[in-house]
Amino acid sequence: KKVVLGKKGDTVELTCNASQKKNTQFHWKNSNQIKILGIQGLFLTKGPSKLSDRADSRKSLWDQGCFSMIIKNLKIEDSDTYICEVENKKEEVELLVFGLTANSDTHLLEGQSLTLTLESPPGSSPSVKCRSPGGKNIQGGRTISVPQLERQDSGTWTCTVSQDQKTVEFKIDIVVLAFQKASSTVYKKEGEQVEFSFPLAFTLEKLTGSGELWWQAERASSSKSWITFDLKNKEVSVKRVTQDPKLQMGKKLPLHLTLPQALPQYAGSGNLTLALEAKTGKLHQEVNLVVMRATQFQENLTCEVWGPTSPKLTLSLKLENKGATVSKQAKAVWVLNPEAGMWQCLLSDSGQVLLESNIKVVPTW
C-alpha cells in the first residue's frame, strides 16, 4: 500500500494509473466504501462523501491513463485509506495528514519560550525535527520546545515530519522581538553631542507601546529615569524628561536619543526598556557612555575617562611627532611638566583607538 503524507490546509494529489493510456471508467472510495468521485461518460461525478466538495480530478490526464484524485484544503480527519478502482483492479493509497502550529503568537520576546505542537492522525507515530534560521536542530515527538529564544532565532523555521520513511516539510515564521544589539557603548569627548540609537531587530506593521530610559551615572549613588515615551504606530512621543540632562528624542523609528553635551557627571550605564502592546515582558537594550576630558592645570597635564570601561583598555598621553608617551590600564594618566606642543589623549582597545582628545600645551617662559 502506497503512503502519502499531506499538510493540513494544503492540497494533495493521490495518483492512480491504468495500463491503457485511454479514458476509462474509474472511481475513488474511502475505507468505508463510500464513493468520493468517479466518471460518467466524460463527466466527473461526485459521491456522498464528506470529501466530495474538496475533491477533484484533472480531465486532461485521463487520456494518459492517469486518474488522480486531488484533495484541497486538507484536514487531519481526511487521513484514511483511499481506494481507486480502475480496469477491474484496486489501488490503495494511505493518506496521513499532519499539522504543525505554534502554541502561542509567533511574535515572541527574546528569552520567551516557543512551543510547536504536531497534530497527527490516530495511530500514527511521527517524529519531528526542526531547524532554526541560525542552524540550531531540535527534535521531538508531538511537541517541540525552545526554552529561551534568542534574536538569531528570528526567521523561518523548517520542520520535517517523518512517518513510514516519508517526510513532509513545514515552514513556520518566527519573529523574535528584540533590539538589534544587547548592548552598545558610546565614546565621547567632554562637551560633544551624544547620539544614542536603539534599532529594532524586527519590523511590525503596527508598533505600539511605551518605554523608558533609566540611567545609572558612575558618580551617582542611585539610578534615575531620564526619559519616558510612548510609541503609537511607529510614532514616538515624549511623556516625561528630566531637566538635567535635557534629552531630546526623535519622532520616528529607530528610537533615537540626543544628549546635548557629554559631561563627566553623565558618564555611566543606561537601560532602555520597551513594553509592546499586547505583549507580556519588555525589550531591553543596555547603553554605556564613556566621557573623556583632557586638562592642563599648572605643571600637570591630565587625561581622565569616566564611565564603564573594561580593565583591558589603555589610556595614553602622547606628544605629537615625539616619542614621549605615558600609558596606563587605568582611568586617568598624567604628565608633570609636559613639553610644549600638541598632546593626544587616546583611549584604545588592543591598538584600536576608541576615543581621542587633543590639548595644546604652550611653553612657559
Epitope: E13, G41, L42, F43, R58, K59, I70, I71
Partner: antibody, heavy 115, light 107 residues
C-alpha cells in the same frame, strides 16, 4: 490567499533564450499544476505548458521542442525557458495555477523580441 | 487540438442590457469549460468553471450554461465594470485551448 509574482528579462534579441520565474506566495504548492500562458499584443491566449511540485511537465506540442519548465519547491517558484526566440514570441507572458482552470494569475511580463 | 470558437468577436451594449456570448468546441468536452474576463493591461480572471459553477466572489449577474460542445456566458444586467474581453477555455485535453475572445464594448 495565493499570490503569484513573476519576473525576468523583458527585451531579447532573436535566437536568445527567454527566461522567466514565478514566485508563489501563500497557499499550497503541492497538488496543483503551475502553468505558463502567453498573449501576443492584441491577440488571444495560448497555453505554453505546466509543471507540478514533483517536476512532471506537460507542454504545448507547437512549442515543445523549445520549452523547458522547471520547479524549485524549496523556494516555491517555477520557471520558464523558451529557446531560439523570434519576433513571433513577442507577447505578455503570464504564470498561473491550474487545477483544470486557471486561478490566480501573475501580473504578466511583456517580452519583446527585437534585433 | 480542440478548437474553441467564440461568437460574436465583439458586441456593443449599454449598462443594464442582457448580453450572451457563445463558445463552441470542435468536439464533445462535457462540462470541462471555463470563462474568463480580461481588462486592458491586466491578467485574465476566472469567472465560471465546470461550464456553470460561479467562482466565489464573482457577482451573480454572471452565469454559464451548456455541455457537450455548445456553451454560453450570460451577463443578466451589464454594469460599467463589465466592459472587457471574455475568453472561454477547454480543460478536456492537452493542449488547453482558448477561444479567440469576445470584446464587450459600450454602445
Amino acid at each position: 490567499q495565493v499570490q503569484l509574482q513573476q519576473w525576468g528579462a523583458g527585451l531579447l534579441k532573436p535566437s536568445e533564450t527567454l527566461s522567466l520565474t514565478c514566485d508563489v506566495y501563500g497557499g499550497s504548492f503541492s497538488g496543483y499544476y503551475w502553468t505558463w500562458i502567453r498573449q501576443p499584443p492584441g491577440k488571444g491566449l495560448e497555453w505554453i505548458g505546466e509543471i507540478n511540485h514533483s517536476g512532471t511537465t506537460n507542454s504545448n506540442p507547437s512549442l515543445k521542442s523549445r520549452v523547458t519548465i522547471s520547479v524549485d519547491t524549496s523556494k516555491s517558484q517555477f520557471s520558464l525557458r523558451l529557446s531560439s526566440v523570434t519576433a513571433a514570441d513577442t507577447a505578455v507572458y503570464f504564470c498561473t495555477r491550474e487545477l483544470n482552470w486557471f486561478d490566480p494569475w501573475g501580473q504578466g511580463t511583456l517580452v519583446t523580441v527585437s534585433s | 487540438d480542440i478548437q474553441m470558437t467564440q461568437s460574436p468577436s465583439s458586441v456593443s451594449a449599454s449598462v443594464g442590457d442582457r448580453v450572451t456570448i457563445t463558445c463552441r468546441a470542435s468536439q464533445d468536452i462535457a462540462n470541462w469549460l471555463a470563462w474568463y474576463q480580461q481588462k486592458p493591461g491586466k491578467a485574465p480572471q476566472l469567472l465560471i468553471y465546470a461550464a456553470s459553477s460561479l467562482l466565489g466572489g464573482v457577482p451573480s449577474r454572471f452565469s454559464g450554461s451548456g455541455s457537450g460542445a455548445d456553451f454560453t456566458l450570460t451577463i443578466s444586467s451589464l454594469h460599467p465594470e463589465d466592459f472587457a474581453t471574455y475568453y472561454c477555455q477547454q480543460a478536456n485535453s492537452f493542449p488547453y485551448t482558448f477561444g479567440q475572445g469576445t470584446k464587450l464594448e459600450i454602445k
